[in-house]
């Protein structure tokens, strides 16, 4: 039975040209996290394998940095980066948990940042 829950940074906004941290946190389960895939709509951004480390998709290498933790940092944001992002936690034996984050990239110099949290 899947008992875990995913907390995410929720809906966030950032300025064009700036950077943002996407973070998810899986809690309330003892399942082993084998891999976390980060996706934008239906496109792979990055993979963090618990044992083997990070892989950044070639088309995002210039603008995506791993971390902090299992999170992902997006840099040099453009308006085209606006949209849904998913953290997909592949766990054993539970299965797959998915978290959703909506990012809005604003032209304006006043971008309200949604609540963010630090994972200890």
């Amino acid at each position: 039975m899947m008992t875990g829950t995913i907390e995410t940074t929720g809906n966030i906004s950032a300025e064009k040209g700036g950077s943002i941290i996407l973070q998810c946190h899986l809690s309330s389960t003892t399942a082993q996290v084998t891999q976390v895939n980060w996706e934008q709509q239906d496109q792979l951004l990055a993979i963090c394998n618990a044992d083997l480390g990070w892989h950044i998709s070639p088309s995002f290498k210039d603008r995506v940095a791993p971390g902090p933790g299992l999170g992902l940092t997006l840099q040099s944001l453009t308006v085209n980066d606006t949209g849904e992002y998913f953290c997909i936690y592949h766990t054993y034996p539970d299965g797959t948990y998915t978290g959703r984050i909506f990012l809005e990239v604003l032209e304006s110099s006043v971008a309200e940042h949604g609540a963010r949290f630090q994972i200890p």
């Epitope: 891999q35 996706e39 993979i47 070639p58």
Partner: nanobody, 116 residues
Framework: EVQLVESGGGLVQAGGSLRLSCAAS????????MGWFRQAPGKEREGISL????????YYADSVKGRFTISADNAKNTVYLQMNSLKPEDTAVYYC?????????WGQGTQVTVSS
């Protein structure tokens, strides 16, 4: 329905070689990674090798680096693990796992036993 079938395990002497295969059927188009994990008695399942579908990057655990080689035949939907210079500590059940944009699927496992 996704099916992963491993083969190639068995009993081998230390220093020997084995080649594991994992044939997949029913996998959706958006494959992300293909990998090999292993689980020794009383231990957690650990990732030992991974190949990505976007650019074929390969990753290895330090414990197998230089001895194991992962490869994929996309036309056959099959991933391989060539294991050379096997050691008794490589004894485990070996599982293949594929991730897609929908989830992760596991094979049933194949036993590898390395005798000294």
């Amino acid at each position: 329905e996704v099916q992963l079938v491993e083969s190639g395990g068995g009993l081998v002497q230390a220093g020997g070689s084995l080649r594991l295969s994992c044939a997949a059927s029913g996998i959706p188009a958006s494959i992300r990674t293909m990998g090999w994990f292993r689980q020794a008695p009383g231990k957690e399942r650990e990732g030992i090798s991974l190949i990505t579908s976007d650019d074929g990057s390969t990753y290895y655990a330090d414990s197998v680096k230089g001895r194991f080689t992962i490869s994929a035949d996309n036309a056959k939907n099959t991933v391989y693990l060539q294991m050379n210079s096997l050691k008794p500590e490589d004894t485990a059940v070996y599982y293949c796992a594929w991730t897609t944009n929908r989830g992760m699927d596991w094979g049933q496992g194949t036993q590898v036993t390395v005798s000294s």
